[in-house]
Interface confidence: low
């Protein structure tokens, strides 16, 4: 087809273009006539016709007025026409700098979003590590200071702070204790910590009947069924996260006790260590 | 080794209370709850009732409420139990033993034989 | 109080035969919390105090050889001994050890034929 680009007349030697013969002109849509010598000067350049091809046959070139040369004095003023396939337009080296640029951009935007991009946080409940325990004979009252234990994983490739640990336990839908631990810590990149956090709490007033369940020896187990709710707040790149728990334990409310932890997802039952 | 060391055989008149002692060795006084069980000729065992020593705290069986009163001396490691108005229905064997937390008794002492007679 | 009943209350056996014994409990000696049944059998030889042999229901206590097998669960339980060896020879006794007051089974007696 007629698909050509406009160029500066006088020809370029950079880019591995070392000028023409008539085979190459005539590959390169040029075609070069015998030269005039009207003013003295060998091989002026006004002395070539320039022809358009067009596949078929040839056009003459537009620019030279019909007369099929560059009128004297218009050198630098006008413009060939030259085809795509001709390979000054097609430089190696800048086609290769410009492919490894985009290739090297691409890796590192890659690269960027692989390590930068946000991956979860896990906050795993691990149990009751102790239970300590203290009565209030006239008040009817039970005080439990109750030790968890939680495991926090970073799964990110940078590290990512602690803000804060809010904790509750409930006992038959009351709150009973409530805690929190504010600037706790650091977590590195793909690193996990293990993080212990007590909870005093107060079974009192409507649940005095509970004292009784928990200080009489007739009874033989003092396990009571407790809620162990807790929302860990985590930050990074200014952005806050909060993932909370919620599990019920077994807590024996008639001694001192500390437990194996439990591993399982489900109740657990937790023996005193003998 | 884990150790009850009871007190000798007694015998005694009908009427005046006794008391038998079971002292505790190789393990943590404490943490163990003491228990008395009572053997006579020809019946099963009887509990009686038990102590904690961490605070002191006792439970008795019914039938023994009045009959039996236990204590400790955890400066001793020492678990005692008074038997009062004694009569022939009283004469039997009694045996400390321990439980830790809700387990069953896994270490008893060697036995106290009281005999009550006039 | 849980009523403890054992059966029979005495047993014949030879050396090397395997015997079974029962006990009954009035009410479930299953904790439902823990799922764990809480009874436990004796063994008690003359002048000597009660021996543990299995708690809860199934366990053996330490040092206990393996020929002594306890099974079963909320009210009926079983003392299985096979081979039984003349050291055996005892009362064995069955305890509720699930809520107090504690209450133990009137025994069973294995003899020698």
């Known amino acids: 087809g007629k698909s050509l680009s406009h160029l500066p007349l006088h020809s370029n030697k950079e880019d591995g273009y070392d000028g023409v013969t008539s085979t190459d002109n005539m590959r390169n849509g040029l075609v070069s006539s015998e030269v005039h010598n009207e003013d003295g000067r060998n091989g002026d350049v006004s002395q070539f016709p320039y022809v358009e091809f067009t596949g078929r046959d040839s056009v003459t070139c537009p620019t030279c007025q019909g007369t099929g040369r560059i009128p004297r004095g218009q050198e630098n003023q006008l413009v060939a026409l030259i085809p795509y396939s001709d390979q000054r337009l097609r430089p190696r080296r800048t086609k290769l700098y410009v492919m490894a640029s985009v290739f090297v951009c691409l890796l590192l935007s890659g690269l960027a979003v692989f390590f930068l991009f946000p991956r979860s946080i896990e906050v795993k409940y691990i149990g009751v590590k102790s239970a300590y325990v203290s009565y209030d004979a006239e008040k009817r009252t039970i005080y439990l200071n109750i030790t968890n234990t939680l495991n926090i994983t970073n799964n990110n490739y940078y590290s990512v702070e602690v803000e804060n640990i809010t904790a509750q336990v409930q006992f038959s839908k009351t709150v009973i204790g409530k805690a929190r631990l504010n600037n706790i810590t650091n977590i590195g990149p793909l690193d996990m910590k293990q993080i212990d956090y007590t909870v005093p709490t107060v079974i009192a007033e409507e649940m005095s009947y509970m004292y009784d369940f928990c200080t009489l020896l007739s009874i033989k187990v003092h396990n009571i069924v407790l809620m162990m709710q807790v929302t860990v707040t985590t930050a990074y790149f200014g952005h806050s996260e909060q993932i909370s728990q919620e599990r019920y334990q077994y807590v024996d409310c008639g001694r001192n006790t500390t437990y194996q932890l439990a591993q399982s997802e489900y109740l657990n039952v937790l023996q005193p260590q003998q | 080794e884990v150790q009850l060391q009871q007190s000798g055989p007694v015998l005694v008149k009908p009427g005046p209370p006794v008391k038998i002692s079971c002292k505790a060795s190789g393990f943590t006084f404490t943490d163990y709850y003491i228990h008395w069980v009572k053997l006579s000729h020809g019946k099963s065992l009887e509990w009686i009732g038990l102590v904690y020593p961490y605070n002191g705290d006792t439970d008795y069986n019914q039938k023994f409420k009045g009959k039996a009163t236990l204590t400790v001396d955890t400066s001793s490691s020492t678990a005692y139990m008074e038997l009062n108005s004694l009569t022939s229905e009283d004469s039997a064997v009694y045996y400390c033993?321990?439980?830790?937390?809700?387990?069953?008794?896994?270490?008893w002492g060697q036995g106290t034989t009281v005999t009550v007679s006039s | 109080d849980i009523v403890m009943t054992q059966s029979p209350s005495s047993l014949s056996v030879s050396a090397g035969e395997k015997v079974t014994m029962s006990c009954k409990s009035s009410q479930s000696l299953l904790n439902s919390g823990n799922q764990r049944n809480y009874l436990a059998w004796y063994q008690q030889k003359p002048g000597q105090p009660p021996k543990l042999l299995i708690y809860?229901?199934?366990t053996r206590e330490s040092g206990v050889p393996d020929r002594f097998t306890g099974s079963g669960s909320g009210t009926d339980f079983t003392l299985t001994i096979s081979n039984v060896q003349a050291e055996d020879l005892a009362v064995y006794y069955c305890?509720?050890?699930?809520?107090?007051?504690?209450?133990f089974g009137a025994g069973t007696k294995l003899e020698l034929k």
């Open positions: 305890q509720n050890d699930h809520s107090y007051p504690l209450t």
């Open positions: 809860g229901a199934s």
């Open positions: 033993a321990r439980t830790y937390y809700a387990n069953s008794p896994d270490y």
